[in-house]
């Protein structure tokens, strides 16, 4: 099996989630990228970039901003003004077409609690849960990408291809990767 280690983020309401997702460049030169939340049995795509890609520009859907670093294989994600109901499991994906996405590791477990965002917090452990997904054939991911400009929302998709540098995991049923604990 392939293990996916989740990183847990704890925030107070009103704060901003700020994470990065690394990706291999060459294969996805003109691909869209998306930010999705696991809801129920399906991932829900909250925001995604559109083709054709141009120089790096932040793109925004509501409280979500995606910004790509085209020369460095890095997608920056911000979710502002966090609310308790935002808690859940999130993933960056390379969105290639409606039936296929490439999930970028690591999954993000977001826990938002009520209270002042100015309240001092204590330290937290970054790695909380370990996922196991079916082992599959591996494909190399290459290096080069140009960045997106605009963002649209899309309905949930049913099939994902999980990717990490050096391998891809093909899942025909997305429930294979979301039947895991979200909270500790």
């Amino acid at each position: 099996t392939t293990e996916l280690t989740e990183e847990k983020y704890e925030y107070k309401e009103g704060q901003t989630l700020e994470v990065k997702c690394d990706y291999a460049l060459e294969k996805y030169a003109n691909s869209r990228k998306a930010w999705q939340k696991m809801e129920g049995k399906m991932p829900k795509i909250l925001a995604k970039t559109e083709r054709p890609s141009e120089n790096s520009h932040p793109v925004q859907v509501g409280r979500i901003t995606l910004e790509d670093y085209p020369d460095h294989g890095l997608l920056q994600v911000r979710m502002t003004n966090l609310q308790v109901e935002d808690s859940g499991l999130y993933q960056c994906v390379i969105y290639q077409h409606p039936k296929e996405s490439h999930v970028l590791f690591n999954p993000i477990c977001l826990v938002v609690t009520k209270g002042s965002s100015g309240t001092p917090g204590s330290s937290e452990n970054s790695t909380q849960n370990v996922y196991r997904t079916p082992s599959t054939t591996a494909k190399a991911l290459g290096p080069r990408y140009t960045s997106p400009r605009t963002v649209t929302q899309a309905p949930p998709e049913s099939t994902v291809v999980v990717s990490t540098p050096g391998s891809e995991i093909n899942l025909t049923n997305v429930t294979d990767i979301i039947r895991v604990p979200v909270f500790n």
């Epitope: 460095h72 294989g73 890095l74 965002s117 100015g118 309240t119 290096p143």
Partner: antibody, heavy 121, light 105 residues
Framework: QVQLVQSGAEVKKPGASVKVSCKAS????????IHWVRQAPGQGLEWMGW????????NYAQKFQGWVTMTRDTSISTAYMELSRLTSDDTAVYYC??????????????WGQGTLVTVSS | SYELTQPPSVSVSPGQTASITCSGD??????VCWYQLKPGQSPILVIY???KRPSGIPERFSGSKSGNTAILTISGTQAMDEADYYC????????FGGGTKLTVL
């Protein structure tokens, strides 16, 4: 435990280059960005750029583009920062630092001990 | 380019509370962290994600934000807290504030 150990102090002449190393241990080297930060005498901290050890790609602060190069040797878990065309203004302590998490760029939780580079004729 | 502004110096008497500010455009929508730097030593992360303390950092260090200003507060300041303090955020590139010298009188 996580450790970043840097190479020793260097004295260089103006116009020369310097290459500082940062050997990582206690974690998976490929999983976390390495950043380079410097502090010149009497000045503040200045971010120079980051290196993605997994891909070898680097992102440099605009000020340093064209005369800094960040590389790595994954076989020995070591990152390098080379600064060329040195001037006296480059006299500083140079630090390497590591991201706190795989999914963030900041903060820098782990730091090397610093390498003093002195540029003098 | 993105800039973070800090006061050059702050003075405080032992046992009193010191507050160091850091201001920047849209800082309210950025994660802010703070570092302590003493002469001859490497920087130490004291606050990250606006208000979280890494393990080993005393409880007297706390962080908060008001609008586009982040605040590092040191309550019951001790002589050992005398140092330079830097805020940091990420906006396309990593940015440090200019630093604040904390003097414990």
């Amino acid at each position: 435990q996580v450790q970043l150990v840097q190479s020793g102090a260097e004295v260089k002449k103006p116009g020369a280059s310097v290459k500082v190393s940062c050997k990582a241990s206690g974690y998976t080297f490929n999983g976390y960005y390495i950043h380079w930060v410097r502090q010149a005498p009497g000045q503040g901290l200045e971010w120079m750029g980051w290196l993605n050890p997994n891909s070898g790609g680097a992102n440099y602060a605009q000020k340093f583009q064209g005369w800094v190069t960040m590389t790595r040797d994954t076989s020995i878990s070591t990152a390098y920062m080379e600064l060329s065309r040195l001037t006296s203004d480059d006299t500083a302590v140079y630090y390497c630092a590591r991201d706190q998490r795989k999914t963030t760029v900041t903060p820098f939780e782990y730091w090397g001990q610093g390498t003093l580079v002195t540029v003098s004729s | 380019s993105y800039e973070l502004t800090q006061p050059p110096s702050v003075s405080v008497s032992p046992g009193q509370t010191a507050s160091i500010t850091c201001s920047g455009d849209k800082l309210g929508e950025r994660n802010v962290c703070w570092y302590q730097l003493k002469p001859g030593q490497s920087p130490i992360l004291v606050i990250y994600q606006d208000n979280k303390r890494p393990s080993g950092i005393p409880e007297r260090f706390s962080g908060s934000k008001s609008g586009n200003t982040a605040i590092l507060t040191i309550s019951g300041t001790q002589a050992m807290d005398e140092a330079d303090y830097y805020c940091q955020a990420w906006d396309r590139n990593v940015v440090f504030g200019g630093g604040t010298k904390l003097t414990v009188l």
